[in-house]
């Protein structure tokens, strides 16, 4: 029976990260799915000494073990503010409320001899109010607050007497509340009661180190639960028609290596020692997991007891939250890796316990106590957990019928006391009225309940369509390092040789014969030949690459021009053109590791020195003169909005460098416009790094403003002066000024003089946008002398999204939003996406890249067809990868094609994503014929 769960880790087959079963699932939960929220009595009720309530073991524990925590002072006070709790439940729109009855509030000394009338009145009022609101109560009989008297008189759960005492208490509850309660939980997470209560001492009663006591307590808890189940089954179920279970908590664990059987067995043991300890007897064969019985510590079940215990749950109530993960001594990891994969645990439960009906009766995470209503990370944890549950239901056919978000209100968090918060509603414990303020997570959960899941795809439906036939399909390379001499010696040696093929395979010179030599040709450069082969394979129409300024002008001025290098670049262009591949050439492409400036310019201050702008103009003119007859698309500077960040000693350096870069670009544009455009008929722009931004938390206004600010500080910073107004964005100027006034920044944005403003305004012939991802941003007041601090923006990683190894989120719709934003905010010009790509570790079948390409092209197509964006070209990033860098290339560093090459070439051949039955695109032959010999003849 048990042990089947091990198959979870045995599954050797690889599932692609872009397989729909692994991606975020946009779908709804089953129609009758139950949405709820839970609390624990001791955590929220307060009034610990009021209205006749007796002390519990936790009252004593707080006093004796949790220094500096005065349990009676600070609480959520649910006992007093029942109405406020009900309003909170109304706000969420839940269909059930899971709460626990405080045993010592009902029976102050633990025995059922005399009930506490005020306590009884409270629970009656709570239940009546829930019924009135059509909210199903799920009632937990024991959530850790054992009457202190029972601990002192009997030793608590170490004593088997507790079994009958618990049954008496349960009987009273069934008799008194059973007409209104259809779902009962006997004990909440017995593992923690035993382990922390008697092993680590981190929970009440705070005993530690006695493993025999730990297992005895576990044994008694199981038997107590079993007795209550039989009692309910025989005496109450026939007329009350309810269900009863026990909430079992667990962690999840992944093996270090799935192909290592020892690791897999350790994982199975780790799960069995926590969840299996209680689940195996109750949901399994009535006994403890085999491997737990090897030590003499664990008590034995007699055959009759096994029979009695087995099957004593009407559904599987499961808890998955921080209490089973932290602190680190909570579970035995057996050298493996804990994981928050709720979907996998549910699969393990399904395999291990014969596909039970499951109620998730506690799930959620925690935030730090200083966080009030803006619990952004809690939203993402909830989103992640809930989607895992949905995937488990839809893909794995796991029978989850309800979900309990934990918890309704901030309250007492056991060993963490008040240092963490888990509520959907914020409560200021020091306030009089203890108002319940909905946190972002409450708004989010409310929305989930309303929608019954995630019905709304983030993107609009996919569409079929094509880009026009003059659309540029390109691939981008960063700096193309030149070959300084030709690599093929062919035709430069005048001698004739005989090849001893059958013998020693050596070449022998034939004396007295001299052949004619010829000057080297473009095809003699091996790297160009390789490059052209790659471009041919991809079927691109355009190739973007950057010149190496330092190689062309080592001294930074025209005193020393490396003609060999210029010739190499001319060869790259001309060989591409022979193939019908048009160049887009970048003059200056700095990278984070290399500023790319000739050394003398670097030494004299780089872009902080205006002389660099003059040197750049001279360099640009040289390039226009030497290559401009062949090159019709020029990029002056690649991503100046990122380059300036490298001048980050102070924000003022950053802004000054940016200012100088804009002027340098503008001067080059005017130079081309005046001298070269009339004869060369090309176009000049600069490319900006243009990631999109979205608020990380849509329920917080400051996040929307932060996203807006990100776009202004990141893109409009350069786009406004160059594309539109000749000045920095007003948002940027005003925000920096306001930070200055408040003493939070000492930044000074340079001023454009009237002359500079005229110089820079409108100095692009097209928009060149490099776009890779969408950033999820939060407002965070920053106070440093770096320019990035001026924007008060921080990024948040959305754990639910498909992301690359370097943590770039795959958010295709961001590119459509960006394109629409550019169209709205700037003049309606042609737009090229000059770099779009992702890193993917796969060296052959790069599935993330293929998925990324398809989805991003799809959104660009929508921008073109629906949003009327004048998108003229799409350049995938990048052709080859560098040995040391994250893997962005279509080809490996030794020029082997990955499967994305074929995928992209198919996109190009189709001119987009046409309907299946459409005729071939743009004069392509009907069948795609690949000529193998052609690549040798190039």
């Amino acid at each position: 029976f048990s042990g089947d769960g091990k198959a979870i880790w045995d599954k050797k087959q690889y599932v692609s990260p872009v397989n729909p079963s692994q991606l975020f699932l946009y779908d709804t939960f089953p129609k009758n799915f139950s949405w709820g929220v839970g609390t624990g009595a001791f955590q929220v009720e307060g009034s610990w000494k009021t209205d006749g309530r007796g002390p519990s073991i936790w009252d004593r524990y707080v006093y004796s073990h949790l220094r500096g925590v005065n349990g009676t002072d600070r609480s959520t006070d649910s006992y007093i503010f029942l109405e406020k709790d009900l309003l909170a439940l109304d706000f969420l729109g839940v269909s059930f409320y899971q709460f626990s009855i405080s045993w010592p509030r009902l029976f102050p000394n633990g025995t059922v001899a005399a009930v506490n009338a005020q306590g009884l009145r409270y629970y009656r009022a709570l239940l009546d109010s829930l019924v009135l609101r059509n909210i199903e109560p799920i009632v937990t009989l024991y959530h850790w607050d054992l009457p202190l008297t029972l601990q002192e008189e009997y030793g608590g759960w170490k004593n088997a007497t507790m079994i009958d005492l618990f049954n008496d208490y349960a009987t009273y509850c069934f008799q008194t509340f059973g007409d209104r309660v259809k779902y009962w939980i006997t004990i909440h997470n017995p593992y923690l009661v035993a382990w922390h209560g008697f092993g680590t001492g981190m929970h009440a009663p705070g005993e530690k180190g006695n493993l025999t006591a730990v297992y005895t307590v576990g044994h008694n808890l199981i038997k107590a639960h079993s007795k209550v189940w039989h009692n309910y089954d025989k005496n109450f179920r026939p007329h009350q028609k309810g269900w009863l279970s026990i909430t079992l908590g667990s962690h999840w664990i992944e093996p270090n290596r799935t192909d290592n059987m020892e690791d897999v067995i350790n994982c199975q043991h780790s799960m069995s020692s926590v969840l299996g300890w209680f689940a195996n007897p109750i949901h399994g064969d009535g006994d403890y997991p085999e491997f737990m019985k090897t030590g003499a510590m664990i008590p034995e079940f007699s055959e009759a007891e096994k029979e009695e215990v087995r099957g004593t749950a009407d559904f599987f109530a499961f808890s998955f939250g921080p209490n089973n993960f932290r602190p680190s001594n909570t579970v035995v990891k057996m050298g493996q890796n804990v994981s928050l994969n709720l979907r996998q645990v549910l699969n393990w439960i399904k395999l291990e316990y014969d596909d039970p009906q499951i109620l998730i009766s506690e799930n959620g995470w925690f935030t730090d106590s200083y966080i009030k209503t803006e619990d952004t990370t809690a939203i993402y944890m909830m989103k992640n957990f809930l989607n895992q549950v949905l995937q488990a239901i839809k893909f794995d056919e796991i029978r989850v019928f309800g979900y309990t978000a934990w918890t309704l209100l901030d309250g007492f968090e056991w060993q963490d006391a008040y240092t963490t918060r888990r509520g959907l509603f914020y409560v200021d414990f020091n306030s009089e009225q203890k108002e319940r303020k909905p946190k972002s997570s409450a708004h989010y959960y409310k929305q989930i309940i309303q929608d019954n899941g995630f019905p709304l795809k983030e993107s609009t439906p996919d569409m079929k369509g094509r880009f026009p036939c003059d659309f540029s399909w390109g691939v981008t390379e960063s700096v193309l390092k030149p070959e300084f001499t030709v690599s093929s010696p062919q035709f430069t040696d005048p001698h004739l040789y005989v090849w001893n093929v059958t013998g020693n395979r050596l070449l022998y010179r034939v004396e007295g014969v001299r052949l004619k030599t010829r000057p080297s040709q473009c095809t003699d450069y091996v790297s160009i030949k390789k490059r052209v082969e790659m471009l041919a394979k991809m079927k691109v129409t355009h190739y973007q690459f950057a010149l190496d300024w330092t190689s062309i002008l080592p001294t930074g001025n025209l005193s020393k021009v490396n003609r060999q290098v210029l010739r190499y670049y001319r060869c790259v262009v001309s060989e591409g053109l022979k193939l019908g591949v048009f160049p887009m050439v970048t003059l200056y492409h700095p990278t984070h590791s290399h500023l790319g400036l000739p050394l003398p310019l670097l030494s004299s201050g780089g872009w902080l020195n205006m002389n660099t702008a003059k040197a750049f103009q001279d360099y640009a003119e040289l390039c226009f003169r030497e290559l401009g007859d062949l090159v019709k698309l020029w990029i002056t500077i690649n991503e100046p909005n990122r380059l300036s960040d490298m001048y980050n000693r102070t924000s003022n350096d950053t802004y000054r460098a940016a200012h100088n870069l804009m002027i340098a670009h503008a001067q080059v544009w005017h130079l081309y416009d005046r001298q070269y455009r009339p004869v060369q008929h090309g176009a000049v722009s600069l490319s900006l790094h243009c990631d999109w931004a979205e608020p990380a938390n849509p329920f917080v206004d400051s996040h929307w403003k932060a996203a807006e600010r990100f776009l202004q500080f990141e893109i409009a910073w350069f786009a406004d002066p160059l594309f539109k107004t000749g000045d920095y964005p007003s948002v940027m100027k005003e925000y920096i000024a306001s930070k200055n006034q408040r003493g939070l920044s000492s930044s000074v944005l340079p001023r454009f003089t009237a002359k500079e403003s005229r110089l820079v305004k409108g100095t692009v012939d097209f928009y060149a946008l490099n776009h890779f991802t969408t950033r999820f941003v939060i407002h965070k007041q920053l106070n440093t002398n770096r320019s990035v601090a001026d924007r008060d923006v921080q990024f948040l990683q959305d754990i639910t999204r498909l992301s690359s190894p370097s943590r770039l989120a795959v958010t295709p719709w961001g590119v459509r939003k960006l394109l629409a934003w550019i169209r709205r905010n700037y003049r309606d010009r042609d737009i090229y996406i000059t770099a779009n790509g992702i890193d993917d570790l796969a060296l052959e079948d790069d599935q993330i890249r293929k998925y990324y390409l398809e989805k991003y092209v799809q959104e660009a197509l929508k921008a073109y067809l629906i949003d009327k964006v004048k998108i003229k070209g799409y350049y995938a990033f990048k052709l080859t990868e560098e040995k040391s860098k994250p893997r962005f290339g279509f080809f490996t560093s030794d020029f082997r094609a990955k499967s994305s090459v074929q995928f992209y070439s198919k996109l190009i051949s189709s001119s987009g994503l046409p309907a299946e039955n459409r005729s071939p695109a743009c004069g392509q032959p009907a069948e795609d014929t690949d000529c193998t010999i052609c690549s040798f003849l190039v």
Partner: antibody, heavy 120, light 111 residues
Framework: QVQLKQSGPGLVQPSQSLSVACTVS????????VHWVRQSPGKGLEWLGV???????DYNAAFISRLTISKDNSKSQVFFKMNSLQTTDTAIYYC??????????????WGQGTSVTVSS | DIVLTQSPTSLAVSLGQRATISCRAS??????????MTWYQQKPGQPPKLLIY???NLQSGIPARFSGSGSRTDFTLTIDPVEADDVATYYC?????????FGGGTKVEIK
């Protein structure tokens, strides 16, 4: 404070053109888009089109053949021209400022409206 | 075009009571995680005035007794409690898709 002042004729002959100018103050047309909306007793509020801060325009497809919106940023003026008016085009014509945020598509300030009657 | 249907067309409410206006769209007005639904108030002889944007966000300067909610195709404007100054016609408007469209309006009067 933000203002949009409209000027234009009250009466237009059938088949003639309607031209309305909208002069804005306290905000820049390089930062905010301007929408045109009309209101008639028969058809309620109808969105006609918009000129965005960058100068690109979007029109309601029902009016695209006879509508032109343009602007002069330096004069803070937006121009609305609709050709071939019929009696059914009788309405109050409003120019209105776009909210101006990337993440909000709404109109936050309206002009006083130009009441246009199409009649011979 | 997306058609917005408002109900009721007119509504008489006692002072201090709650007024609820519904707006139903012929197709979803949500995309890319945003709810493109806006509410305006128009008093006789005046242009419309922005109350709520993105379905639930209160425009600055608008009293907190106005609130918006809803998702996909069903949206609600609530005024609670209603004051004498709230007598007006209320319009919903979607901007998820061109052309932007408005509801037919709901006239609120005091009982």
């Amino acid at each position: 404070q933000v203002q949009l002042k409209q000027s234009g004729p009250g009466l237009v002959q059938p088949s003639q053109s309607l031209s309305v100018a909208c002069t804005v103050s306290d905000f820049s047309l390089t930062t905010y888009g301007v929408h045109w909306v009309r209101q008639s007793p028969g058809k309620g509020l109808e969105w006609l089109g918009v000129i965005w801060s960058g100068g690109s325009t979007d029109y309601n497809a029902a009016f695209i053949s006879r509508l032109t919106i343009s602007k002069d940023n330096s004069k803070s003026q937006v121009f609305f021209k609709m050709n071939s008016l019929q009696t059914t085009d009788t309405a109050i014509y409003y120019c209105a400022r776009d909210y101006g945020s990337t993440y909000v598509d709404a109109i936050d300030y309206w002009g006083q409206g130009t009441s246009v009657t199409v009649s011979s | 075009d997306i058609v917005l249907t408002q109900s009721p067309t007119s509504l008489a409410v006692s002072l201090g009571q709650r007024a609820t206006i519904s707006c139903r769209a012929s197709e979803s007005v949500e995309s890319y995680g945003n709810r493109y639904m806006t509410w305006y108030q128009q008093k006789p002889g005046q242009p419309p005035k922005l109350l709520i944007y993105r379905a639930a966000n209160l425009q600055s300067g608008i009293p907190a007794r106005f609130s918006g909610s809803g998702s996909r195709t069903d949206f609600t404007l609530t005024i609670d409690p209603v004051e004498a100054d709230d007598v007006a016609t209320y319009y919903c408007q979607q901007s998820n898709e061109d052309p932007w469209t408005f509801g037919g309006g709901t006239k609120v009067e005091i009982k």
